[in-house]
Amino acid sequence: SAPGEDEECGRVRDFVAKLANNTHQHVFDDLRGSVSLSWVGDSTGVILVLTTFHVPLVIMTFGQSKLYRSEDYGKNFKDITDLINNTFIRTEFGMAIGPENSGKVVLTAEVSGGSRGGRIFRSSDFAKNFVQTDLPFHPLTQMMYSPQNSDYLLALSTENGLWVSKNFGGKWEEIHKAVCLAKWGSDNTIFFTTYANGSCKADLGALELWRTSDLGKSFKTIGVKIYSFGLGGRFLFASVMADKDTTRRIHVSTDQGDTWSMAQLPSVGQEQFYSILAANDDMVFMHVDEPGDTGFGTIFTSDDRGIVYSKSLDRHLYTTTGGETDFTNVTSLRGVYITSVLSEDNSIQTMITFDQGGRWTHLRKPENSECDATAKNKNECSLHIHASYSISQKLNVPMAPLSEPNAVGIVIAHGSVGDAISVMVPDVYISDDGGYSWTKMLEGPHYYTILDSGGIIVAIEHSSRPINVIKFSTDEGQCWQTYTFTRDPIYATGLASEPGARSMNISIWGFTESFLTSQWVSYTIDFKDILERNCEEKDYTIWLAHSTDPEDYEDGCILGYKEQFLRLRKSSVCQNGRDYVVTKQPSICLCSLEDFLCDFGYYRPENDSKCVEQPELKGHDLEFCLYGREEHLTTNGYRKIPGDKCQGGVNPVREVKDLKKKCTSNFLSPEKQNSKSN
């Protein structure tokens, strides 16, 4: 049925009184300025809100900050600006919130020009108290927490020094100078690039990649001629300048940089770039930019070593280095990713993969939608999703696509239905099966969020006019009910709910404007009384993910296994609850050739599932280097797709070949490696 507030589908009775009793307003008594909001910890209910206001004076800009804290999911806020001595906080550094439930917060303050160093405010008790610490350097970046130990902090200074603290920012030590980029790896390891001569920019392509595993006591140079590096899953990547020219190649390590292999990816020139789109412990999605200012490139997917790559998607939209791409991991269903391609006619189209980049297709047209003006055939068209690129182009798209791991199968996004993305005002669409089928959910642009692991979806209109109505659905977006949360409409700027979609609270943020003043205001609504009871076994039904044809014996098989989930029935109005854990049951599938990718030196001819040897390796770019040495590679031409769990069935056995590889990269052969100690 078409989206709307149909009387027939009013699931929740007498909700107005229940919600009215659970609606809390807070007016922030400062001028509008800008506002940033951070959640501190998981299930703590603690929110920090930082408002900043710039007053441009004749000579300089005077800044004023206010800090507010809530410990009840935003129902009430307390002004705690005095805890940070009424200091102006630098919003470009944001609020550095510690990992997991550490309760740690670091705020970076603005200090006057002549000071020796910067200033931070530190809290380790969920922002109940703050300690002021003056730094021996001026920070260039936000403080970075070690994922393993939240007491270990890392920062780069404006002078390119690498600073480390082992006691949550109390004491700092400069462990290296001339540092361009630094990142935490696993086990409190730090990776960083250094320049020898001029600067980061001047030495680009001549940087060295270093590693310290003991917070700066000792170092190991693990790469030279480095352009940049990145971490993804268990992979460490470095782009390395070639000897002969200005091109560079990707090298990959799975042992923290002790040994490297050259990735079987095209080299790129000065104006091009590589980008890790997504990575996990199994594999990597890598974007390789096309030559020239095309705005697109190619997506490649890796094998389990990060070495052999299969072409996944051509003409992948990615504007410039650090620019915009629509690549989105649909976290509510395994193997699903959505992105955009730039077609030959320069229109932008959405593509989806259900098998981790193996195949890409257009999104199925929603049953309750008509094809728009971009469609040549009014009966045949697709759904196209607005994501980062549309937002960057200032289209009327307030939010990127949304999915949550604990709201199985649900994807919500703005989109249009036609042959390509339309610049017309978009509508909101929902899929309840991870992107296979879609339904128009709401007319026009909205802010939306998922609560209670999918038990409730809430939305507010994105409008230039003030609003006072919130919409909610308890059946995965099929039917909507509306609640007037205030008599006096506000200019809404968004919705805020605790990350992880387990909360029952939603905050509507916005501002009120009167003749002389404008003030920030938030309305927090607790939906706990709408879902009066806890869900029981009878409230769930069994669902097979990735099902497309029940008559196919292997229906639902993706990457070698199928998964059945217990999903909340659409008719059940009950609480999944904070402790809800997705119940799923995997079953292994039989192997087919689809479960294998072609190994080094082999390829799949068009429309063929068999891997054939590249004819005498002629005309193929096979510069390939394993562990920095020339050596033999033995292969039978097939390699199981990373993360594939199939068993039995097809086992592609053929004689094992020895492929002589040529190692044309002089990137760090083992004898060049050196270690240093502080």
Epitope: E8, R11, D433, I542, L544, H546, E551, D555, Q564, S571
Partner: antibody, heavy 124, light 106 residues
Framework: QVQLVQSGAEVKKPGSSVKVSCKAS????????ISWVRQAPGQGLEWMGG????????NYAQKFQGRVTITADESTSTAYMELSSLRSEDTAVYYC?????????????????WGQGTTVTVSS | DIQMTQSPSTLSASVGDRVTITCRAS??????LAWYQQKPGKAPKLLIY???SLESGVPSRFSGSGSGTEFTLTISSLQPDDFATYYC????????FGGGTKVEIK
């Protein structure tokens, strides 16, 4: 064409158990839920429960919880329904039926294939 | 569990008549409703699934409509073969059937 063939009629004493089988042929048994529905003489249809052969996930109507056990054997494409502590009110025709499926949901699309029914008579 | 109330319980009609049977759910079930036809001594036969989708092989004189809590099965022109008992069944909760509607010759 999919067919469901059920075991023959049974006469049982009160307090005993009955186990009815339902063998599928001509389709992918494992990918569909099998429901069990009964019909007492002159009465309407009553759903007892169902099972999904993959993983053996069974669920039961509240009324029969604890008294009915539904199982499936993928290797023989057979589903079973066992009803214990029989009483005279359990005298009925017992049907197995395949739940039609158009999406990943097993129970939402109606029962498109039915067995011929098994008459169970409970009498002392 | 969700209760299904079917009406009427008996309906007398003649060949060629337009017949409408109603089914009401105790709570909203979206479109998850099926209709069956059963003849004496036979297993039920699926006519309609998802409230309005016609099962393959079923004559087009049968149609279903409704969503939420109110549903109808319509036989546009009753044929001799259509005299039987009709059941609705909801699928968005533990499955429950309506009490049945017997369509008999007037």
């Amino acid at each position: 064409q999919v067919q469901l063939v059920q075991s023959g009629a049974e006469v049982k004493k009160p307090g005993s158990s009955v186990k009815v089988s339902c063998k599928a042929s001509g389709g992918t048994f494992r990918n569909y839920a099998i429901s069990w529905v009964r019909q007492a003489p002159g009465q309407g249809l009553e759903w007892m429960g169902g099972i999904i052969p993959i993983g053996g996930w069974a669920n039961y109507a509240q009324k029969f919880q604890g008294r009915v056990t539904i199982t499936a054997d993928e290797s023989t494409s057979t589903a079973y329904m066992e009803l214990s502590s029989l009483r005279s009110e359990d005298t009925a025709v017992y049907y197995c039926a395949r739940q039609g499926r158009k999406t990943g949901y097993y129970y939402y699309y109606g029962m498109d294939v039915w067995g011929q029914g098994t008459t169970v008579t409970v009498s002392s | 569990d969700i209760q299904m109330t079917q009406s009427p319980s008996t309906l007398s009609a003649s060949v060629g008549d337009r017949v409408t049977i109603t089914c009401r759910a105790s709570q909203s079930i979206s479109s998850w409703l099926a209709w069956y036809q059963q003849k004496p001594g036979k297993a039920p036969k699926l006519l309609i699934y998802k409230a309005s989708s016609l099962e393959s092989g079923v004559p087009s004189r049968f149609s279903g409509s409704g969503s939420g809590t109110e549903f109808t099965l319509t036989i546009s022109s009753l044929q001799p073969d259509d005299f039987a008992t009709y059941y609705c069944q909801q699928a968005d909760g533990h499955i429950t059937f309506g009490g049945g509607t017997k369509v008999e010759i007037k």
